[in-house]
Each structure stands twice: as structure tokens, then as C-alpha cells.
């Protein structure tokens, strides 16, 4: 696999968002009072100076953490198993591709700091999500809030990926 974050990776990311959307089990209108500020680290995905290593590291850690979050007994009890299996498969495919790419990028000499720093930040963010679910006793509304939060953060991360791709296109055409 080449490591130009090909079109099919973008498609897989969009497919993950579609699956997360389809997983909805209860009306979010019932869950207003359960909203929580998870403090998604926006600065990580909003910068204009995007390094390939940084983007891939953010996407890899995001997908790894989403995979872990939705790969638990609690999660299996909360969601439709067919959709959950599809989500696991899609995430696994994306992770495999990104792991190949990360090895190549590190081999090309991009700094390890660009890779380890986002990972730590994202782990803290997802830890906050896990604490929230536990506090809320894994209620339907808590899972619904988390589902929408994950959709938002994945959407922002995917946008970052699109920005890198268009930057690469611009460089390639100049």
C-alpha cells in the first residue's frame, strides 16, 4: 500500500461515520441533560501546518481508541451487534493501513515526537469518555452522548485528513 492517504481511506472514514450514525438506538432529544464537555483537543486537528506523521498519528490513535471503546462487553450490550461488527471490521482495516503508513513515515525520518504527542493527548480525552460512561452507569443516554461526541471528533479528524490530501495535491500540481 502507498502512503498518500488514498481515497479509499477517506471512504472508510466516511463509512465509519455512517455506521456510527446508523447505530443510534434512542432519540437524542431524551438526553439533553446528559451533555458533557469532553474537551476534545481541537488544536490537534485545526492547525494549518499539517505534517503527514502528525495527521497519521492522530487518525491512528483516534481509530484505535474508538475500536477499544466499542470493543467491550458494555458496548456489546448497548449496540446492535451487526452494526457493531461492521464498525469493528471497518476500523480494523483502517488501522492496518495506517500502521503500514506510520512505519513508512518514521522510516522516512519524520520526528517521533509528532507521533507520540497526539497519542497521549487523545488517550486522556478518551479516558474522560470512559470515566463519564462509568459515572452514568453506561445508560442509554450516556452511550448516545458518547456516540455523538465520537462522530464529532472523527468528523474533525477526517477533515484534517482531507486538508492534508488537498495540500499534497496543491504541492503536486505546482
Amino acid at each position: 500500500l502507498g502512503c498518500d492517504l488514498p481515497q479509499n481511506h477517506g471512504l472508510l472514514s466516511r463509512n465509519t461515520l455512517v455506521l456510527l450514525h446508523q447505530m443510534r438506538r434512542i432519540s437524542p432529544f431524551l438526553c439533553l441533560k446528559d451533555r458533557r464537555d469532553f474537551r476534545f483537543p481541537q488544536e490537534m486537528v485545526k492547525g494549518s501546518q499539517l505534517q503527514k506523521a502528525h495527521v497519521m498519528s492522530v487518525l491512528h490513535e483516534m481509530l484505535q481508541q474508538i475500536f477499544s471503546l466499542f470493543h467491550t462487553e458494555r458496548s456489546s450490550a448497548a449496540w446492535n451487534m451487526t452494526l457493531l461488527d461492521q464498525l469493528h471490521t471497518g476500523l480494523h482495516q483502517q488501522l492496518q493501513h495506517l500502521e503500514t503508513c506510520l512505519l513508512q513515515v518514521v522510516g522516512e525520518g519524520e520526528s517521533a515526537g509528532a507521533i507520540s504527542s497526539p497519542a497521549l493527548t487523545l488517550r486522556r480525552y478518551f479516558q474522560g469518555i470512559r470515566v463519564y460512561l462509568k459515572e452514568k452507569k453506561y445508560s442509554d443516554c450516556a452511550w448516545e452522548v458518547v456516540r455523538m461526541e465520537i462522530m464529532k471528533s472523527l468528523f474533525l479528524s477526517t477533515n484534517m485528513q482531507e486538508r492534508l490530501r488537498s495540500k499534497d495535491r496543491d504541492l503536486g500540481s505546482s
Partner: antibody
């Protein structure tokens, strides 16, 4: 730039039907809910209901349930408020506003300019 | 439904005055309380969200406080453009409800 643009003022007769619109631009339309708020002449703000444009799920205030219908067409980033049979008491300014759903972000941070509906025989 | 009660209904003040408007909810709404400003013929404008967070672009003379059932909007030094009607609104649960409004007039 985020914008909600509402359709123009309407003058109707009692018993007539009406559908007003609210078109969103400058943001991901399906990532936010759209709420509708009524303001009768010289009065305060009343929340009517809300829609999630991603799947057209709706919630209404008990005061407006059965009186109006809220809908959305995500393909054209537009939400609607409609009446099947208008009454003189429906005369008011109607506003749409976007809501972040379950995400931790400001409620009703952007509003349409309002649509004045006048119902008179 | 959660009732929102604002006080006073109207007040007269001068430029430079410190103005305080209160809002009381009929049950605890945590910090799910927003404040809006509305000028005649215009759409409402969000000032404060989640009880105390200042909306982007809103002058720092506006501040909000409170939690549970009692909330306050403060304008530290009233400016000519602040003469308007102010509404509180709870977003703790549906149906969303607004206070009846507080009209701030020139003394």
C-alpha cells in the same frame, strides 16, 4: 460564514395552509439541530419544536404539538415549519435557530432573520 | 415543563450603570442556562451559554453566573447599544423554555 436564511413575509387568510423555510449554509447542516421559535407581536420568545436534519427526528413543545409540522430536506440544507390550517392567533414572527444537539457547544448560536406571518380575513 | 421566571420585568438605567437581571428555574437545571439579547425588529442574539460562558464576539462587560435554580446576568457598565430585551432559556430538558424577558430602558 454560518448563515440561516428564512423565507419572506407571508400574508394569509384563516384556514389556509403555509410552509416557511430556513436554509442553512457555512456549516455541516446535518451536524446541528434546527429549532423554531415563535414571537407574537409585543410578546416574548416561545420554543415550538426542533428537528435533527440528519434523520428528521422531531420534538415539539406540548403547546404546539399537532398545530404545526417541522420537517427538513438535508439535500438542500433546509428546514421547514408548516401549518395545514392557519388561525388569526398564528400571526407572529417565526425564527429558526441552530442547536448543537448533544455536543457541548453553545445553544441557538445562529438565528435566521425571522419570517413574519400575518393571518387576517 | 420547567418554568423560567425573570426579574425584574423591566428596569431603567443610565449609561455606565451596573445592571443585574436574575432568572429562576422551577427545578434544578444544573448549568444548562443561556442568555439572549433582542433588539426591536431583530433576531435574538446569544450572549452567555452554559450559565457563565461568554459567546464569541460578545463584549466582556456581559457575564453570567449561577447553577441549579438561580442565575444572574450582569452588565458591568451599561453602554448605549445595550438597551434591549434580555431572555434566559433553559436547555436542560424538553420542552425548552424561555423566561418572559427583561426590558432594559434608558433612564
Amino acid at each position: 460564514e454560518v448563515q440561516l436564511v428564512q423565507s419572506g413575509a407571508e400574508v394569509k387568510k384563516p384556514g389556509e395552509s403555509l410552509k416557511i423555510s430556513c436554509k442553512g449554509s457555512g456549516y455541516s447542516f446535518t451536524s446541528y439541530w434546527i429549532g423554531w421559535v415563535r414571537q407574537m407581536p409585543g410578546k416574548g420568545l416561545e420554543w415550538m419544536g426542533i428537528i435533527d436534519p440528519s434523520d428528521s427526528d422531531t420534538a415539539y413543545s406540548p403547546s404546539f404539538q399537532g398545530q404545526v409540522t417541522i420537517s427538513a430536506d438535508k439535500s438542500i440544507s433546509t428546514a421547514y415549519l408548516q401549518w395545514s390550517s392557519l388561525k388569526a392567533s398564528d400571526t407572529a414572527m417565526y425564527y429558526c435557530a441552530r442547536h448543537p444537539g448533544l455536543n457541548w457547544a453553545p445553544d441557538f448560536d445562529y438565528w435566521g432573520q425571522g419570517t413574519l406571518v400575518t393571518v387576517s380575513s | 415543563d420547567i418554568q423560567m421566571t425573570q426579574s425584574p420585568s423591566s428596569l431603567s438605567a443610565s449609561v455606565g450603570d451596573r445592571v443585574t437581571i436574575t432568572c429562576r428555574a422551577s427545578q434544578s437545571i444544573s448549568k444548562f442556562l443561556n442568555w439572549y439579547q433582542q433588539k426591536p425588529g431583530k433576531a435574538p442574539k446569544l450572549l452567555i451559554y452554559f450559565a457563565s460562558s461568554l459567546q464569541s464576539g460578545v463584549p466582556s462587560r456581559f457575564s453570567g453566573s449561577g447553577s441549579g435554580t438561580d442565575f444572574t446576568l450582569t452588565i458591568s457598565s451599561l453602554q448605549p447599544e445595550d438597551f434591549a430585551t434580555y431572555y434566559c432559556q433553559q436547555s436542560y430538558d424538553f420542552p425548552i423554555t424561555f423566561g418572559q424577558g427583561t426590558k432594559v430602558e434608558i433612564k
